[in-house]
Interface confidence: low
């Protein structure tokens, strides 16, 4: 009985199409597949950023795969051919591994890359990124931001930079059509007459960096002798009501501070007849049903009630 062997895939490579971290892994079928014409050969692909403890593993019949990587680090990948047991009258047969690596050769020392990169998607409408120049870069250094997400033909450069003393320190993005719930890739590189500048790569999803506007139209309504209902409205904009969480801060008679997190636009508060003053503020955040993360809005304007008969008052901000 001759042992069945299969070769690894040929021409295994990682191709960078210029999408700032979204890479193509591609290969060709192994040599000498003639005796397995009736078989559908599969490939097991493993890949990771260098330094990562875990490999991502994919089994596919295709000759390519695409995924996002952190280009601040190198990438390593390996692939082998799998012959399913149906092809071999027995157990699955695996080839040896074909391996490849990819990295962008770093320019300049790490201290030259941008510091404290911060991106916020305001009200799920306007993306703004800001950064500080690298520690110790000269004042002639300027940074440029490029971005890409699936749907764009190629990476685009920022066209509306935020500047300080003539140096780019941020970017206001244009309207980004169909850009949420997918990886958004950014590269900030730099130029200087004197020094090579290290590039920085960032990847995030826009829905996870949303900072909503604060709630508006805060009101009080007396529900009973010992209950007051606090109400507010969601801010204008594209974020649906179902996507909000709220945090309320309530102060009674300048002493008791109540904080609570709720999922809808009302909160019922137990009070005593002695309550002379009631103030509250609310802020909003995109909830776990619509994103994995988010940023609290600013607090709303404070709404206060002072006086005798709360039942006769409905205050509108």
């Amino acid at each position: 009985d001759t042992e069945i062997k299969v070769n690894p895939p040929q021409d295994f490579e990682i191709v960078d199409p210029g999408y700032l971290g979204y890479l193509y892994l591609q290969w060709q079928p192994p040599l000498s597949l003639d005796h397995f014409k009736e078989c559908t050969v599969e490939y097991e692909l493993k890949y990771r950023n260098i330094g990562s403890e875990t490999w991502k593993t994919i089994i596919t019949k295709n000759l390519h795969y695409k995924d996002g990587f952190d280009l601040n680090k190198g990438i390593e990948a390996k692939i082998h051919t799998l012959l399913p047991w149906q092809c071999t009258n027995g157990s699955e047969v695996q080839s040896s591994w074909a391996e490849t690596t990819y990295w962008i050769s770093p320019q300049g020392i790490p201290e030259t890359k941008v510091q404290d990169m911060d991106c916020v998607y305001y009200n799920w409408q306007y993306l703004l990124c800001s950064w500080k120049p690298g520690i110790g870069v000269l004042l002639d250094t300027n940074y440029n931001l490029f971005y890409w997400y699936e749907g764009l033909d190629h990476a685009l450069q920022c066209v509306d930079y935020i500047k300080a003393d003539g140096q780019n320190i941020g970017c206001r993005f244009p309207y980004l059509e169909a850009s949420d719930y997918k990886d958004f890739y950014i590269c900030v590189n730099g130029s200087s007459e004197n020094k090579p500048i290290r590039s920085s790569y960032f990847t995030f999803q826009l829905q996870n960096i949303v900072k909503p506007l604060p709630p508006v139209y805060l009101t009080f309504t007396r529900e009973s002798s010992c209950e007051i209902k606090l109400k507010w409205s969601i801010p204008l904009g594209p974020i649906p009501a179902r996507c909000f969480d709220y945090e309320i801060e309530i102060r009674e008679d300048d002493t008791t501070l109540v904080t609570a997190t709720v999922e809808n636009e009302t909160y019922t508060l137990k009070t005593t007849n002695e309550t002379r003053q009631l103030c509250f503020v609310v802020r909003s955040k995109v909830n776990i049903y619509c994103s994995d993360d988010g940023i609290w809005s600013e607090w709303s304007d404070k709404q206060c009630w002072e006086g005798e008969d709360l039942s006769k008052k409905t205050l509108l901000r």
Partner: antibody, heavy 119, light 111 residues
Framework: QVQLVQSGAEVKKPGASVKVSCKAS????????MNWVRQAPGQGLEWMGR????????HYNQKFKDRVTMTRDTSTSTVYMELSSLRSEDTAVYYC????????????WGQGTLVTVSS | DIQLTQSPSSLSASVGDRVTITCRAS??????????MNWFQQKPGKAPKLLIY???RQGSGDPARFSGSGSGTDFTLTISSLQPEDFATYFC?????????FGGGTKVEIK
């Protein structure tokens, strides 16, 4: 490890010139600036200027502008500081000090070269 | 030129003491959110040694007892618990503007 090794002590007469060398090793020479700082006996520190080892660009302290010349030789990773028209008040220890740009600090220093100007 | 005034010019302290040295600049040394202020230690007959850069970032390999703070024109170097090897002269230095300038130094002596 990073090392900056300077040339030996010099005794010069007023009006002469002195050229101090600083040989760098243990890092990528062209990624950094080299600063020159001097210290008169019992005095504080005085920055004279710097040279970019990558492009050769120099920034001099105006006080020394007409008398100081800084050069570098990338093939030997060596920086030179020449001070001309010496006077007795130039008697000092001269240090080379590596730095990356403006805010990174001068993080490695040579051992110093004593230049004595005396008639 | 930006002038740097260090105080005190000298101080006597004991091992274990907390020591604070201040440096005042004649104008702000901040730019782009970075304070261009560095601190050095120098022992007799030796080259200066970088302790703190960018006002508060520690030089590599420096003990955690050295810390820097401040922004704008007022900066502080703090030694949280003075050790025998810390008796030396300390200089502040600005690198916002050429010519870079140093403070006059603070000599820390054994009480």
């Amino acid at each position: 490890q990073v090392q900056l090794v300077q040339s030996g002590a010099e005794v010069k007469k007023p009006g002469a010139s002195v050229k101090v060398s600083c040989k760098a090793s243990g890092y990528t020479f062209t990624n950094y600036w080299m600063n020159w700082v001097r210290q008169a006996p019992g005095q504080g520190l005085e920055w004279m200027g710097r040279i970019d080892a990558y492009a050769g660009e120099t920034h001099y302290n105006q006080k020394f502008k007409d008398r100081v010349t800084m050069t570098r030789d990338t093939s030997t990773s060596t920086v030179y500081m020449e001070l001309s028209s010496l006077r007795s008040e130039d008697t000092a220890v001269y240090y080379c000090a590596r730095g990356y740009g403006d805010a990174y600090g001068m993080d490695h220093w040579g051992q110093g070269t004593l230049v004595t100007v005396s008639s | 030129d930006i002038q740097l005034t260090q105080s005190p010019s000298s101080l006597s302290a004991s091992v274990g003491d907390r020591v604070t040295i201040t440096c005042r600049a004649s104008e702000s040394v901040d730019n782009y959110g970075i304070s261009f202020m560095n601190w050095f230690q120098q022992k007799p007959g030796k080259a200066p040694k970088l302790l703190i850069y960018a006002a508060s970032r520690q030089g590599s390999g420096d003990p955690a007892r050295f810390s820097g703070s401040g922004s704008g024109t007022d900066f502080t170097l703090t030694i949280s618990s003075l050790q025998p090897e810390d008796f030396a002269t300390y200089f502040c230095q600005q690198s916002k503007e050429v010519p870079w300038t140093f403070g006059g130094g603070t000599k820390v002596e054994i009480k």
